[in-house]
């Protein structure tokens, strides 16, 4: 399912998983949006368990999740930290 | 530079408790994503992993040592440790610390220190 | 836990020879597999990561690849410096488990 490396393009995750990352296991979001060598959207997600993972970020349960973080984010102290990563 | 070094006593009998010190530089254990993790390979033959212990003091062990092993950190030294109580033979091997980087790609044990022989006898 | 077999364990090939070492994984580790070179006397330095995926400053010869769950390196020409243990890791799931190592000697 997942594979990530170094590519040409400079693109952190050459496959991505769509199944679902549950919200109490996700410990950190990265979204880093095209640029510096890199044609696509990358979503990165940290677990708890100590994993890294590369998600595809037309997922529709991570639009939802990424919702939901972001409203929280406003109200209280957000669950799982969302970086939107800059494209240098 | 990422360098990582290992300390330890080199002999001790079975029994005793093994006290094993990884200092390194180049990164620091206070990082969001950082590890360190230690294996150990008997002379002539493959690696074992022991345990990983992580920035935010997560750790994790090897189950076939988990009740005589322990992994702890030292942030404002740049140490981690490793010890493994009531030695035997069995334990006689060079004992290696390893970085290990929450990173996209992920590669676990991507800087090793030198290692450090570590003999169990009467 | 996870059991990584590695196959041969010693292996003795002339320069210029095309190489493979395998190791097949107990359960599914998803491409979550590193090769390691070590040397005599040195510590292990990661060759392949992800199963398929040169880490910087290996050279092209190596290279790796993966059937069902049968992981392998492949070294296309055999040269006299890749004389070395080689070990795969599964990072999959705790505990981490490696192969038992194959050492590559030279005819």
């Known amino acids: 399912i997942l594979e990530a490396h170094y590519t040409n393009l400079k693109c952190r995750c050459s496959g991505v998983i769509s199944t679902v990352v549950g919200l109490n296991i996700i410990d950190r979001i990265q979204v880093t949006p095209p640029g510096n060598g890199c044609p696509k959207t990358e979503v990165v997600i940290w677990t708890k368990m100590k994993k890294v993972i590369c998600v595809n970020p037309r997922a529709k349960w991570l639009q939802r999740l990424l919702r939901h973080v972001q409203s929280k984010s406003l109200s209280s102290t957000p669950q799982a930290p969302v970086s939107k990563r800059r494209a240098a | 530079q990422v360098t990582l070094k290992e300390s330890g006593p080199g002999i001790l009998q079975p029994s005793q408790t093994l006290s094993l010190t990884c200092t390194f530089s180049?990164?620091?254990?206070?990082?969001?994503?950082?590890?360190v993790g230690w294996i150990r390979q008997p002379s002539g033959k493959g690696l074992e992993w022991l345990a990983n212990?992580?920035?935010?003091?997560?750790?994790y062990s090897n189950p076939s040592l988990q009740s005589r092993l322990t992994i702890s950190k030292d942030t404002s030294n740049n140490q981690a440790f490793l010890t493994i109580t009531n030695v035997d033979t069995a334990d006689t091997a060079t004992y290696y610390c390893?970085?290990?980087?929450?990173?996209?790609?992920?590669?676990?044990?991507?800087?090793w220190g030198q290692g450090v022989r570590v003999t169990v006898s009467s | 836990d996870i059991q990584m077999t590695q196959s041969p364990s010693s292996m003795s090939a002339s320069l210029g020879d095309r190489v493979t070492i395998t190791c097949q994984a107990s359960?599914?580790?998803?491409?979550?597999l590193i090769w390691f070179q070590q040397k005599p006397g040195r510590s292990p330095r990661p060759m392949i990561y992800?199963?398929?995926n040169l880490a910087n400053g290996v050279p092209s010869r190596f290279s790796g690849s993966r059937s069902g769950s049968d992981y392998s390196l492949t070294i296309s020409s055999l040269e006299s410096e890749d004389m070395a243990d080689y070990h795969c890791?599964?990072?999959?799931?705790?505990?981490?488990?490696f192969g038992s190592g194959t050492k590559l000697e030279i005819k």
């Open positions: 212990i992580w920035w935010d003091d997560d750790k």
């Open positions: 180049g990164f620091s254990l206070t990082t969001y994503g950082m590890g």
């Open positions: 890791l599964q990072f999959k799931q705790y505990p981490f488990t």
């Open positions: 390893a970085r290990s980087e929450l990173v996209m790609p992920y590669v676990p044990f991507d800087y």
């Open positions: 359960q599914d580790i998803d491409n979550h």
């Open positions: 992800y199963a398929t």
